[in-house]
Interface confidence: low
């Protein structure tokens, strides 16, 4: 060993005076002369190109060219390689360390607030984490020791820029403006793309990204790449940011972030972002199931391990709150799974954003932008082939859960594409094969990862999936700052935290209700309605008296039909009253002359056959509602396309008489004939099926008015603008929220624990063309249509101005989890 030492370049690199055993040299020219010592390459050359320590490097003489140091003074000089302590000083590495060593919070002096690191690995689909866990020891350790969700839902379209910016603003793409990686804004008359400088124009970027939220509240923020971080949003950049350069090695990115953590307290950021292009790049190139992706996962895992090791070296591994997530997933595409517009149009005289989330607009912009006939394009693309692999939509008709309509950059024609398919202009597009993303955010292949670890997070926990709009509020809570207004629901991720920072409370009711009182059993105005079955005033008086409930009857109906409390009205100045019936309760909106909501509980019926028809052609005035606030039966004669539907289905009756409680004008809502067919099938068949499977369901349903398609209830004047010749406003959508007990041994009204929800928001359209139902029985398309328009309870609340579940005895944060839950039925990945 002594000889070896004498012939070694250890601590002698580039020392021109050194002569080793047999006169070997370690100077810069030794290679040319051929007299280098045996370890010159490993010790002096290779060590300057690596980010790690090894037995050759420990105690090395400091080399200027080194990326990081393993010299004995590197801790003092703060330039050690991330693994110096574990390799050179024998400390346990972060990877080998036991989970349990994390105490409450282990922050060194000067770290009063645990820093937050937001780390994105582009295109890391959730399934990778389970399939390739053994190949990713560092990320898998984070998953084991910290908290993770089964997956995190990306926003639509499941693209890089929209989702990265959603994560840091809590806003939907329609709200923050980055609605795709490529887009046109007619007001700016400019095109945005990832390859043009235009992407750095602040006019594209709305909302308040996390770095600004932190900075506005006295904290510093550093971004090592993040979409938007190089843009002067609201006139400001992050405190520290790096101009995007995809060729910067991951280790260099990590090393720089660790250096930022070494800054003096006054200069040190509290919020950091880190972005890796992988595994997205490899996923595009080879598809999600490929050797390239496996290799990329090992690369990002190694770099992530370097970060954790570097944190441990600084004693920050149990101080920093780190969130590791992705923007979206990845799916395989095929060159034989292409839809070409040339198969649908003789001539392509429009501009198409091609791929998994296509949009179509005028070719000639801005000149033809507003005059472009989007309706005609959708008509020409609807129900054209039996095996069509996309559905065309006008954006206001897209499922409301997507929140993808209210922005001038979102072109009016949208194609919702089947998994693994691409829609393009013509066969000249050969951009296929490999992987892609952008698809429906319910597809399992589009699911992203979410893992978190740190003093604020629970340990060794798996949580239910949630949406990436919720991450911004979570990060604000970690930094103990106030979030800017956003689309997330603050408090809905409190279950991720050991000690929640923000305790939500139920919204306060804005418009108080009254009770529509019963005065006279005979109406002062029959509202042009007829019910031949009620042949005289005595019979009419008898059925109307059924509407005059005693206090005991009111208490009973509330217990059964409003088991979680009356929906609270959060709209301003809404004159509304409660109408109690034995089998349902409704909230009547006087200005709209129709029920705002109706609530009833369908028990588990022994018989699951469809409900019988009700007494035909029987409608009458509700004696509790003044004629001036009621619809008239004559309204429905004026527009032959519109008929009336019932919010509470009269056929769901416990006695033959009780159907008369539902055959009243206050239970009526305007419906297109074609829509009503679907509505009636849902209530007579599917609802009974759900009630049977779930031991009863509570149903709350009602109309929605969202003419300006912004995902929020319309102001009264907005609705008034759209009243046609019928004098009654026509809803743009109808909602149905089904609630049952998660523990199916309990009925909804006696549910002690968690609830199960199934909310739908169905566009109210004059035709059912969305389902291509021609020649098909309802059984083949209605359920699929409802499922396509599944939503969150929160989406219903925003569209109606109602607030649900206020009387459910459960912490508000748990109620918010329920309200932000999106049921999914996807099984294929």
């Amino acid at each position: 060993r002594k000889l070896e030492k004498q012939g070694s370049c250890r601590k002698k690199c580039f020392d021109a005076s050194f002569r080793g055993l047999e006169n070997c040299r370690c100077d810069v020219a030794c290679k040319d002369r051929g007299d280098c010592c045996w370890d010159f390459e490993d010790t002096c050359v290779a060590s300057t190109r690596i980010w790690t320590c090894n037995k050759f490097r420990c105690g090395e003489t400091r080399l200027e060219a080194s990326l990081c140091s393993c010299s004995d003074d590197c801790l003092q000089r703060k330039d050690c390689c991330a693994d110096y302590k574990s390799v050179c000083q024998g400390e346990t590495s972060w990877l080998e360390e036991n989970c349990d060593t994390a105490q409450q919070s282990q922050c060194p002096e000067g770290f009063d607030l645990p820093p937050v690191i937001l780390f994105s690995m582009d295109g890391f689909r959730a399934e990778y984490l389970y399939t390739w866990d053994t190949l990713m020891p560092n990320i898998n350790k984070l998953k084991t020791c910290g908290i993770h969700s089964k997956y995190m839902r990306a926003m639509y379209p499941t693209k890089t820029f929209p989702n990265h910016y959603t994560i840091v603003t809590g806003l939907y793409p329609e709200s923050h403006g980055i609605i795709d990686n490529n887009m046109y804004d007619v007001n700016l008359n400019k095109n945005f793309s990832l390859s043009s400088e235009e992407q750095n124009n602040p006019a594209w970027w709305h909302g308040q990204p996390m770095w600004l939220t932190a900075m506005y509240q006295g904290l510093k923020a550093a971004t090592y790449f993040w979409p938007g971080s190089e843009v002067a949003i609201n006139g400001s950049f992050p405190s520290i940011y790096m101009p995007y350069n995809r060729s910067v090695p991951y280790e260099e990115r990590i090393s720089t972030l660790l250096k930022w953590l070494d800054l003096p307290k006054a200069e040190r950021p509290s919020f950091y972002t880190m972005y890796f292009e992988e595994p997205d790049s490899s996923g595009h190139a080879g598809g999600p199931v490929s050797a390239r992706v496996i290799k990329a996962l090992q690369v990002v895992d190694h770099a992530f391990g370097m970060l954790m090791e570097g944190l441990k070296q600084r004693n920050l591994h149990n101080c920093v709150n780190i969130i590791l997530l992705a923007d979206h997933g990845m799916d395989q595409t095929y060159c034989n799974k292409m839809e070409y517009m040339t198969d649908y149009f003789p001539r392509i005289n429009f501009y198409m954003y091609e791929g998994p989330a296509p949009r179509i607009r005028a070719f000639n912009v801005p000149h033809d932008f507003f005059s472009f006939n989007s309706e005609e394009i959708v008509r020409n693309l609807s129900c054209r082939k039996p095996d069509q692999h996309f559905k065309p939509y006008l954006t206001p008709d897209l499922p409301k859960r997507l929140h993808y309509a209210k922005n001038v950059r979102i072109d009016k024609v949208h194609l919702f594409v089947d998994r693994q398919w691409l829609a393009v202009g013509s066969k000249s597009n050969t951009n296929c094969g490999g992987g892609n993303h952008g698809y429906n955010n319910e597809f399992r292949s589009m699911e992203a990862i979410f893992l978190a670890h740190g003093p604020s997070f629970k340990e060794k926990t798996e949580v239910e999936p949630f949406e990436n709009i919720e991450v911004y509020n979570l990060m604000c809570d970690l930094l103990r700052i106030q979030p800017a207004p956003n689309n997330g629901t603050r408090g809905s991720l409190n279950h991720l935290l050991k000690v929640p920072f923000y305790e939500p409370s139920h919204a306060e009711e804005v418009s108080k209700f009254s009770v529509c009182g019963f005065a006279n059993p005979l109406p002062t105005d029959n509202l042009s309605c007829l019910c031949p079955h009620l042949q005289n005033s005595i019979q009419l008086e008898q059925v109307n008296q059924m509407l005059n409930l005693t206090q005991e009857e009111i208490t009973a109906t509330v217990k059964v039909n409003l088991p979680f409390g009356r929906p609270r009205v959060l709209q301003k100045n809404v004159d509304n009253c409660l109408l109690y019936h034995r089998e349902y309760v409704s909230g009547f909106g006087k200005a709209m002359r129709m029920p705002m909501w109706s609530s009833y509980t369908v028990p588990q019926l022994g018989d699951t056959s469809p409900l019988p028809p009700t007494v035909p052609d029987c409608l009458r005035a509700d004696v509790r509602v003044p004629p001036s606030e009621s619809q008239k039966c004559s309204f429905y004669l004026a527009d032959e396309n519109i008929t009336h539907g019932f919010l509470y289905p009269p056929a769901i009756n416990r006695t033959s008489d009780s159907q008369y409680d539902a055959l009243i004008m206050s239970n009526l809502v305007p419906m297109y004939e074609e829509f009503r067919k679907m509505w009636d099938y849902f209530h007579s068949v599917l609802l009974i099926k759900h009630a049977t499977e779930r031991n009863g369901v509570n149903v709350v349903s009602g109309p929605i008015f969202d003419y300006n398609y912004d995902g929020h209830f319309d102001a009264p004047e907005e609705i008034t603008k759209h009243i046609a010749n019928t004098d009654i406003p026509i809803p743009t959508h109808y909602f149905v929220v089904l609630t049952s007990c998660k523990n199916k041994s309990h009925t909804p009204e006696n549910c002690p624990g968690w609830l199960d929800v199934l909310p739908f928001i169905i566009p109210h359209r004059p035709t059912n063309v969305e389902s291509c139902p021609e020649g098909k029985p309802e059984a083949l398309w209605v359920e699929e249509r409802f499922t396509a328009h599944i939503a969150r309870v929160r989406d219903v609340e925003l569209l109606t101005g109602l607030d649900f579940y206020q009387d459910k005895a459960q912490p508000v944060s748990e109620i918010l989890q329920l309200k932000t839950y999106l049921p999914t039925f996807e099984t294929t990945i």
Partner: antibody, heavy 119, light 107 residues
């Protein structure tokens, strides 16, 4: 651009009546509450009351209830503050302000109307 | 009625200083608080709503924080145009009430 433009300065004698106005533009006037705020010379701001022009629903501060009347004419996008019998203590600057549609905070203010009551 | 107490009632500061004004509510008002700036002879101008959200067009040197009963308005680096009187106002319950104001003067 959202704007509230108030009527000009008024000089009145005690006991006289007065109606000052606040005209909104650049937004749907009927959809936002309009509030009135008093500022006596050298003093702070006092909330008097507000009106929802859509249905003329009003709310008053107990200190001003019965002293003033708030009204609105949504057809001409104008809100009013009126006195049936002025007192010297009504001498002040009066501001109208729009309440934000979502947050209820006063986001846009009129330029103010000076009312001087002196014999 | 909810009383809003502002402190200090006046302060002297120099350009570039960090200035903090506090506002205390006599009972919890969640984050239903706004801050206004008023210059002599001018109408108040909205700076912050919902305790911490910046009105559009307001410079980022202004920030608000707090919830419940204690609130703060911070000017991170005072500019010449910031010398004015600042008011807080609660809009959690009726009647709406303002703080007494804080006059920021040139030192």
């Amino acid at each position: 651009e959202v704007q509230l433009v108030q009527s000009g300065a008024e000089v009145k004698k005690p006991g006289e009546s007065l109606k000052i106005s606040c005209k909104g533009s650049g937004y749907r006037f009927a959809s936002n509450w309009i509030g009135w705020v008093r500022q006596m010379p050298g003093k702070g701001l006092e909330w008097m009351g507000e009106i929802y022009p859509g249905d003329s629903n009003t709310r008053y501060s107990p200190s001003f209830q019965g002293q003033v009347t708030i009204s609105a004419d949504k057809s001409i996008s104008t809100a009013y503050l009126q006195w049936s019998s002025l007192k010297a203590s009504d001498t002040a600057m009066y501001y109208c302000a729009r309440k934000d549609y979502y947050y209820y905070a006063m986001d846009v203010w009129g330029q103010g109307t000076t009312v001087t009551v002196s014999s | 009625d909810i009383q809003m107490t502002q402190s200090p009632s006046s302060l002297s500061a120099s350009v570039g200083d960090r200035v903090t004004i506090t506002c205390r509510a006599s009972q919890g008002i969640r984050t239903n608080l706004a801050w206004f700036q008023q210059k002599p002879g001018k109408a108040p101008k909205s700076l912050i709503y919902a305790a911490s959200s910046l009105q559009s067009g307001v410079p980022s040197r202004f920030s608000g924080s707090g919830s419940g009963t204690d609130f703060t308005l911070t000017i991170s680096s005072l500019q010449p145009e910031d010398f004015a009187t600042y008011y807080c106002q609660q809009y959690n319950s009726y009647p709406r009430t303002f703080g007494g104001g804080t006059k920021v003067e040139i030192k």
